[in-house]
């Protein structure tokens, strides 16, 4: 399940006398090119990431789906380590994402696209826990409902990550990852799953339809999306409190 090695080399950043910590640090030292870069978050070995440079600074692409070329129905260890092709579809890896965010709050951007070409860009404030929390995503109220929380405490809800072989979802009666597909912060199963099975047309059987890529509050429950991209950017340390 290792991330494939890219063809082109990572860019050099001369102003830093070490590898950059993340895409945002790259942006802050003047890098304006998007693409593949080697980074080294604190306490982590170096690894390659896809950076997208925008008016909101440098963002790390943590997930991309657009053609069904990569199987996302994988076990815990794969989601932890990352898999896919950095030039195509991929999941960066929970451990890598956590090493980038550390204990800081982060901004999560989610780009969704349906089969009619309509697009939606969502932004959330989140906090990602480490493996000891099953990489729980702590959510502010607006997104918590979309990931399965019916009532959200003021501090936000923590939704653990789940795969078919490590069931941490908020349902006692079922394993969301088994009944749906892929690994995700499932909550109560029915609100979203951007790591589901890729469908080019809407399956007739509801059981199959449930396994797709969907975001309930945008195109509806189980509408199979055409493309998704997830990007993350840690907030400055003082903004995390």
């Amino acid at each position: 399940p290792e991330m494939a090695q890219p063809v082109d080399p990572a860019h050099n950043v001369s102003r830093l006398h070490r590898l950059p910590r993340d895409c945002q640090e790259l942006f802050q030292v003047g890098e304006r090119q998007s693409g593949l870069f080697e980074i080294q978050p604190q306490g982590s070995p170096p690894f390659l990431v896809n950076c997208k440079m925008t008016s909101d600074g440098g963002w790390t692409v943590i997930q991309r789906r657009h053609d069904g070329s990569v199987d996302f129905n994988r076990p815990w260890e794969a989601y932890k380590a990352g898999f896919g092709d950095p030039h195509g579809e991929f999941w960066l890896g929970l451990e890598k994402v956590h090493s980038i965010t550390g204990d800081r709050n982060s901004r999560l951007a989610v780009q969704l696209r349906d089969w009619d070409g309509n697009a939606e860009l969502l932004q959330f404030s989140v906090h990602l826990g480490g493996e000891d929390t099953a990489y729980s995503l702590q959510l502010t109220a607006p997104v918590a409902g979309q990931l399965g929380a019916t009532t959200v405490p003021p501090s936000g809800l923590s939704v653990p990550f789940s795969t078919w072989d490590q069931d941490h979802d908020l349902r006692r009666d079922k394993n969301c990852a088994k009944s749906l597909s892929g690994g995700w912060w499932f909550g109560t199963c029915s609100h979203s799953n951007l790591n589901g099975q890729y469908f080019r047309s809407i399956p007739q059987q509801r059981q199959k339809l449930k396994k797709g890529i969907f975001w309930k509050t945008w195109r509806g429950r189980y509408y199979p999306l055409q493309a998704t991209t997830m990007l993350i950017q840690p907030m400055a340390a003082e903004a995390a409190s």
Partner: antibody
Framework: EVQLVESGGGLVQPGRSLKLSCAAS????????MAWVRQTPTKGLEWVAS????????YYRDSVKGRFTISRDNAKNTQYLQMDSLRSEDTATYYC???????????WGQGVMVTVSS | DIQMTQSPSFLSASVGDRVTINCKAS??????LNWYQQKLGEAPKRLIY???NLQTGIPSRFSGSGSGTDYTLTISSLQPEDFATYFC?????????FGGGTKLELK
């Protein structure tokens, strides 16, 4: 439906000021970076300035730095371009544009004409 | 800054023709390339985003291809409403740069 409507253009003398506005509707304004792009028959399309979603970060092309100020009011779904010390070479049609994360400039306003002449 | 060289600057063609317009970047832009159409007195309209993705509501006769530094917009069968100016935008490098434009005229 995404709509961007510019206003505030006109004829102005060199050295004077003008403020452009862009009213946005049909999308969550605070989720998108915004930009101003200008167009002339000789130079074609030129990016002028960009602003981050929250408005705290701004970027300018070198030729307008120190003279132009981009800003936004997310409560009013509006972005602005304050143009000071205008020069004849600033004469152009100015477009307000929406900038997404992974697909960049997707929607443009109809444009507003700015003419700097004595 | 990344330079975008668009060719040709002018193109004469007839209804039904297949036409191609090219944009060459001064360095790799990782498929972050959009194509736009602009008619006289109108705002630019995005046709293609990220090299080959068709914008909502754009006819399928428009297509895009390319990678690295070389990108192409193809109109498979020209229609009367397609006579306009076309330009590309690279957004691999923030804030992005435009091609010089291609004016497509009726032969």
């Amino acid at each position: 439906e995404v709509q961007l409507v510019e206003s505030g253009g006109g004829l102005v003398q060199p050295g004077r000021s003008l403020k452009l506005s862009c009213a946005a509707s049909g999308f969550t304004f605070s989720n998108y970076g915004m930009a101003w792009v200008r167009q002339t028959p000789t130079k074609g399309l030129e990016w002028v300035a960009s602003i981050s979603t929250g408005g705290s970060d701004t970027y300018y092309r070198d030729s307008v730095k120190g003279r132009f100020t981009i800003s936004r009011d997310n409560a009013k779904n509006t972005q602005y371009l304050q143009m000071d010390s205008l020069r004849s070479e600033d004469t152009a049609t100015y477009y307000c544009a929406r900038q997404g994360f992974t697909e960049d400039t997707d929607y443009w306003g109809q444009g507003v004409m700015v003419t700097v002449s004595s | 800054d990344i330079q975008m060289t668009q060719s040709p600057s002018f193109l004469s063609a007839s209804v039904g023709d297949r036409v191609t317009i090219n944009c060459k970047a001064s360095q790799n832009i990782n498929k972050y390339l959009n194509w736009y159409q602009q008619k006289l007195g109108e705002a630019p309209k995005r046709l293609i985003y990220n090299t080959n993705n068709l914008q909502t509501g754009i006819p399928s006769r428009f297509s895009g291809s390319g990678s690295g530094t070389d990108y192409t917009l193809t109109i498979s069968s020209l229609q009367p409403e397609d006579f306009a100016t076309y330009f590309c935008l690279q957004h691999n490098s923030f804030p992005g740069t435009f091609g010089g434009g291609t004016k497509l005229e009726l032969k």
